[in-house]
C-alpha cells in the first residue's frame, strides 16, 4: 500500500544531536530477513480468474536488480466455460515498494532509497452498480 | 516477487577500491519519487470475488512505519449470486518489499535494509486437478 | 452523516504564521487520509497536503513544501495545517477533504479564508 | 505534472437542454478522474469518481464517459439548480491536478 514521504523525522537524529554530516546515514550492510521468500500457489497468474502476464525489468545500479511487473491479460475475468465475462472487471493489485539506488562516481559509492509502483497481480472485481434514484 | 540475495556484489565497492569501513555504506538522505502512491479503483478489497481485510502494522523503528497486510475473507470465491463457491479458491498474492530498519545508541543512528513479506491482495484461480494415476 | 468544519483563517501579514483546523465526524476518521485544497479569489482548485490515517504518511505540493505541516490527532477527530512564512499568493479559501482512495476527495468542508496582505 | 484542459470555458444553455462538458488529460490518467461541481460561496461536490460512477446521492441525468486521455460529463437534462462551474480532476499521478473549470450559465 503506502510508504510514507521522508521529509519528516524518520532518518533525522534526535534533536539534542548534532546533524548528519554532508545529508548522508550509515546504512549497515547485509538484509535482515533476506532469506525469506514468496511462497504462492503454482501459476496463479494463469489460473486466476483475472489471468497476468509478467514483465522484468533490470537495473544493474538498483537492488533489487529485478523488478517484476504484472499487466491484467483481460478487461474483463475468465468464466467458468474459459470465455471472457465483460460483466466483471480485472483490475491490478499495486504495491508501494523501496528498492535502492546505487550511485558511484570511481571509489566513492552511495546509495538511495526510491520508491517504485510494482503491480503484483491482478484481481476480478464487480463493476460499481448503480440503483435508480 | 523474488529479492535476490544480497550477499554478493551490488553494495561493495570495486575491487581495486579500499574495503568500506566498520562494514557499512552511505545512504543519502531523501527517497527519490517519493510522492507517488499507489491509486486503485475504489473498495476493490470489498468488490474482489476473492475478497479480503486489511490489517495494518505500525512500528516507529520502520520505514515505512505503517505496513498493511491483506487476508483473504473466504477459502472459496464469491460468485454471481453473492455465495461461496468452493469449487474455486482464494489465494494471497504476496510481495516481497524492502523496508528500513532504524537501530540507535544515544547519538548514534544507524540503519539496516529489511526484507518484508506483504500480502497485497487475493485472486481468485482455479484449483490445480490431480488425476488419478 | 459525515461532516468536516474548517477554523482558522484570517488575515495576515507576509511572513506570518497561521494555524487552520477541521474538526471531522460521522465517520472513523482515524482509517482515512486527509487533504487539504485551496482555491484563490476568482481561481480553480489546487491541491496542498495529504495525511495518512495514522499520519505515517506525508505529501505536499511543491508550492506549500517546506512551509507548510499537515498534522492529525485522531483522538480529537482534527486535522491541521501550519501555515508558516505565508505569501500573497497563499490568499485562498482552504477546504479540508476526506479520502475515500488515493486523492479520491469524497466529502469536503465549507472551507476556511486566508487573506496573506500587508 | 498532469495538465487537465477542459472545454468549453463557459457553456451557454436552457434548463432542459443536454449538456456535454469535455476534459483532456496531458498523459493518460486511466479512468482515475473526477467530476465536481462547485456553487458560489460553496465547496466542491463530487458527482462522478473514477470517470464514470456516480457518487452517492448524485442524480441520474449526471453520466461520466471517457478513459486515458479524453472523459466527459454529460447532463442529460438540466436542471435549474445545475448551473454551476464544472471541474475535472486526476489521481493517478502525483500531484492529483484540477481542470480550470467549465461555467454553466443560464442563455
Known amino acids: 500500500r503506502k510508504i510514507p514521504k521522508v521529509g519528516h523525522t524518520f532518518f533525522q537524529k534526535p534533536e539534542s544531536c548534532p546533524p548528519v554530516p554532508g545529508g548522508s546515514m550509515k546504512l549497515d550492510i547485509g538484509i535482515i530477513n533476506e532469506n525469506q521468500r514468496v511462497s504462492m500457489s503454482r501459476n496463479i497468474e494463469s489460473r486466476s480468474t483475472s489471468p497476468w502476464n509478467y514483465t522484468v525489468t533490470w537495473d544493474p545500479n538498483r537492488y533489487p536488480s529485478e523488478v517484476v511487473q504484472a499487466q491484467c491479460r483481460n478487461l474483463g475475468c475468465i468464466n467458468a466455460q474459459g470465455k471472457e465475462d465483460i460483466s466483471m472487471n480485472s483490475v491490478p493489485i499495486q504495491q508501494e515498494t523501496l528498492v535502492v539506488r546505487r550511485k558511484h562516481q570511481g571509489c566513492s559509492v552511495s546509495f538511495q532509497l526510491e520508491k517504485v509502483l510494482v503491480t503484483v497481480g491482478c484481481t476480478c472485481v464487480t463493476p460499481v452498480i448503480h440503483h435508480v434514484q | 516477487r523474488k529479492i535476490p540475495k544480497v550477499g554478493h556484489t551490488f553494495f561493495q565497492k570495486p575491487e581495486s577500491c579500499p574495503p568500506v569501513p566498520g562494514g557499512s555504506m552511505k545512504l543519502d538522505i531523501g527517497i527519490i519519487n517519493e510522492n507517488q502512491r499507489v491509486s486503485m479503483s475504489r473498495n476493490i478489497e470489498s468488490r474482489s470475488t476473492s475478497p479480503w481485510n486489511y490489517t495494518v502494522t505500525w512500528d516507529p523503528n520502520r520505514y515505512p512505519s505503517e505496513v498493511v497486510q491483506a487476508q483473504c475473507r473466504n477459502l472459496g470465491c464469491i460468485n454471481a449470486q453473492g455465495k461461496e463457491d468452493i469449487s474455486m479458491n482464494s489465494v494471497p498474492i504476496q510481495q516481497e518489499t524492502l523496508v528500513v530498519r532504524r537501530k540507535h545508541q544515544g547519538c548514534s543512528v544507524s540503519f539496516q535494509l529489511e526484507k518484508v513479506l506483504v500480502t497485497v491482495g487475493c485472486t481468485c484461480v482455479t484449483p490445480v486437478i490431480h488425476h488419478v494415476q | 452523516e459525515v461532516q468536516l468544519l474548517e477554523s482558522g483563517g484570517g488575515l495576515v501579514q507576509p511572513g506570518g504564521s497561521l494555524r487552520l483546523s477541521c474538526a471531522a465526524s460521522g465517520f472513523t476518521f482515524s482509517s482515512y487520509a486527509m487533504n487539504w485544497v485551496r482555491q484563490a479569489p476568482g481561481k480553480g482548485l489546487e491541491w496542498v497536503s495529504t495525511i495518512s490515517g495514522r499520519g505515517g504518511s506525508i505529501y505536499y505540493a511543491d508550492s506549500v513544501k517546506g512551509r507548510f505541516t499537515i498534522s492529525r490527532d485522531n483522538s480529537k477527530n482534527t486535522l491541521y495545517l501550519q501555515m508558516n512564512s505565508l505569501r500573497a499568493e497563499d490568499t485562498a479559501v482552504y477546504y479540508c477533504a476526506k479520502e475515500e482512495a488515493t486523492w479520491d476527495f469524497d466529502y469536503w468542508g465549507q472551507g476556511t479564508t486566508v487573506t496573506v496582505s500587508s | 505534472e498532469i495538465v487537465l484542459t477542459q472545454s468549453p470555458a463557459t457553456l451557454s444553455l436552457s434548463p432542459g437542454e443536454r449538456a456535454t462538458l469535455s476534459c483532456r488529460a496531458s498523459q493518460s490518467v486511466s479512468s482515475f478522474l473526477a467530476w465536481f461541481q462547485q456553487k458560489p460561496g460553496q465547496a466542491p461536490r463530487l458527482l462522478i469518481y473514477d470517470a464514470s460512477n456516480r457518487a452517492t446521492g448524485i442524480p441520474a441525468r449526471f453520466s461520466g464517459s471517457g478513459s486515458g486521455t479524453d472523459f466527459t460529463l454529460t447532463i442529460s437534462s438540466l436542471e435549474p439548480e445545475d448551473f454551476a462551474v464544472y471541474y475535472c480532476?486526476?489521481?493517478?499521478?502525483?500531484?492529483?491536478?484540477f481542470g480550470q473549470g467549465t461555467k454553466v450559465e443560464i442563455k
Open positions: 480532476q486526476q489521481r493517478s499521478n502525483w500531484p492529483p491536478t
